[in-house]
């Protein structure tokens, strides 16, 4: 099967790398614009320069292109706890991240929220907190994991999954009491 190419990809594939086919004259290959610039005017003819202009403040292009407009710089989303790691430049978008001792949770491909890394109180750190993953905790005996926190088995209701985790502990307590009475 031949992969389906969009019109733009079809046009580009006719020209060598780093060039694109002139939209009005398919016998002309124009040089693409460098990152940090955008296409102002197509090249007038073969071997002639493409008119590329630098992106204005607040916009960028991160790779060679023949875009008619630069892309708008992203803004870090304060309501999601995001902080700016590096500012937008003409050839690189804003880089957003989280504060120290926080991790990113991606709600979708292009939306993340910052949350505090779990401290594993009443448990031990099985895997340390990573940029995109919370700490993985292992709970001490008598505790179970709920929403990545170690909660006392005394808070375990029969209907919850914790019964499986807390049952051995409960049985142990009963066993100890029974053996102590003989």
């Amino acid at each position: 099967l031949v992969p389906h190419l969009g019109d733009r990809e079809k046009r580009d594939s006719v020209c060598p790398q780093g060039k694109y086919i002139h939209p009005q004259n398919n016998s002309i290959c124009c040089t693409k614009c460098h990152k940090g610039t955008y296409l102002y005017n197509d090249c007038p003819g073969p071997g002639q320069d493409t008119d590329c202009r630098e992106c204005e403040s607040g916009s960028f292009t991160a790779s060679e292109n023949h875009l008619r407009h630069c892309l708008s710089c992203s803004k870090c989303r304060k309501e999601m706890g995001q902080v700016e790691i590096s500012s937008c430049t003409v050839d690189r978008d804003t880089v957003c991240g989280c504060r120290k001792n926080q991790y990113r949770h991606y709600w979708s491909e292009n939306l993340f929220q910052c949350f505090n890394c779990s401290l594993c109180l009443n448990g031990t750190v099985h895997l340390s907190c990573q940029e995109k993953q919370n700490t993985v905790c292992t709970c001490h005996a008598g505790f179970f994991l709920r929403e990545n926190e170690c909660v006392s088995c005394s808070n375990c209701k029969k209907s919850l999954e914790c019964t499986k985790l807390c049952l051995p502990q409960i049985e142990n307590v009963k066993g100890t009491e029974d053996s102590g009475t003989t």
């Epitope: 803004k75 989303r77 304060k78 309501e79 999601m80 949770h105 709600w107 929220q113 949350f115 919370n134 929403e147 990545n148």
Partner: nanobody
Framework: EVQLLESGGGLVQPGGSLRLSCAAS????????MVWVRQAPGRGLEWVSH????????FYADSVKGRFTISRDNSKNTLYLQMNSLRAEDTAVYYC????????????WGQGTLVTVSS
């Protein structure tokens, strides 16, 4: 006690419009970022849109950008979702929720309102 009550769902033809509302109580609505999520039959939760407390710079999922508009009226403690140019793939139960704070789960969300897009 936090309460979120969605309304406005229903059956609509492709290309049609609906406006969902979410009445909030039990917390200071004007201080909270509010979220619309949806769940299509047999699918997981999908983040649709959210709006910060001041109503500025809302976020939209790529799948709804240019068709849906989120808004809020802090004086009425109400969140809205205007849905235009509806498609069959927008069929889902729509929930409003408070932006999570402690971790990546929803502590507070409504019972949902069903939107069915079909001819």
């Amino acid at each position: 006690e936090v309460q979120l009550l969605e309304s406005g769902g229903g059956l609509v033809q492709p290309g049609g419009s609906l406006r969902l509302s979410c009445a909030a109580s039990g917390f200071t609505f004007a201080h909270e970022t509010m979220v619309w999520v949806r769940q299509a039959p047999g699918r997981g939760l999908e983040w649709v849109s959210h709006i910060p407390s001041d109503g500025q710079d809302p976020f939209y999922a790529d799948s709804v950008k240019g068709r849906f508009t989120i808004s809020r009226d802090n004086s009425k403690n109400t969140l809205y979702l205007q849905m235009n140019s509806l498609r069959a793939e927008d069929t889902a139960v729509y929930y409003c929720a408070l932006l999570p704070k402690r971790g990546p789960w929803f502590d507070y969300w409504g019972q949902g309102t069903l939107v069915t897009v079909s001819s």
